[in-house]
């Protein structure tokens, strides 16, 4: 089975760890795929190690473990993320995470200050 936090949040400009945990008494993990919606983020293979898709190579760091660290988050990164565990002999297992990227607290404070500033 796949165990993961279904919903997580992070601040714009910050980073977040995407993590799925696979547990099985018999099956061994051979490959893990990570996708942002329909877009491939990264792949881990027991044979080949990690490969981060070139589109994300400046923002995605493999790990910890079989998870991913997604950096320099933007509001556009809000959405569904999927981990797919390829196992032998167990088959394929999928997990889903919804990431909500929020405005940074600095931005929110700045916006509040701007809104309450007296008009000249």
């Amino acid at each position: 089975t796949i165990d993961t936090k279904r919903n997580i949040s992070a601040e714009e400009g910050g980073s977040v760890i995407l993590q799925c945990h696979f547990s099985s008494d018999t099956a061994e993990v051979t490959q893990v795929d990570w996708k942002q919606q329909d877009q491939l983020l990264a792949i881990y293979s027991v044979d080949l190690g990690w490969h981060v898709a070139s589109v994300f190579s400046d923002r995605v760091v493999p790990g910890p473990s079989l998870g991913l660290t997604f950096q320099s988050l933007t509001m556009n990164d809000t959405g569904e993320y999927f981990c797919t565990y390829h196992t032998y002999p167990g088959g394929i297992y999928k997990g889903r995470i919804f990431l909500k990227v929020q405005e940074s607290s600095d931005d929110r404070n700045g916006l509040a200050q701007f809104q309450t500033a007296p008009l000249g």
């Epitope: 490959q31 996708k35 877009q39 491939l40 792949i43 293979s45 044979d47 032998y88």
Partner: antibody, heavy 118, light 107 residues
Amino acid sequence: EVQLLESGGGLVQPGGSLRLSCAASGFTFSSYSMNWVRQAPGKGLEWVAYIKSNSGTKGYADSVKGRFTISRDNSKNTLYLQMNSLRAEDTAVYYCARGPYDYWLDYWGQGTLVTVSS
Amino acid sequence: DIQMTQSPSSLSASVGDRVTITCRASQSISSYLNWYQQKPGKAPKLLIYAASSLQSGVPSRFSGSGSGTDFTLTISSLQPEDFATYYCQQSYSTPLTFGGGTKVEIK
């Protein structure tokens, strides 16, 4: 530098057999899935077969299933394609190609021509 | 089997032109779509993998986009060495299947 070198092509009569080889160098051959892809003269690309790194999983196009057998010898860094019951429509350039993560074909050999004709 | 349909089958363009080739899958293939370039008498060369990721060493004038069933390969400014045939290929499921190819010729 990654290199893939096919050999074993040639002229064979319909119903005959041929074994193609692909010698790999410049990478850890035993870690990669490998594929055979062919191209008939003046035509497009057609995937033929693949084999996973440990030889545990193989797959074939319907057009060659039961006639062609893919295999590998990781100790020799070599991929093979045994082709039996050859038909005229098997005439093509046969390429071996490396398949990292099973999702794309990043390096290809130069190809070897198989001609099936009486 | 998943059918891959490329269009156009051929096109004529000039150096410096922006060129767009499309590929449509008969069912959703997520982002498991690759693009290859082939020159006469040579082996295919990987340009774009996973729909939009540029293969190492490939010039940045090549780009890919799309997901699901509709995909595009764009050459932002055609160079003399880009005249070739381009193929899309799905790796969502076996059998792996290729589009019929798009031949880019000199106008």
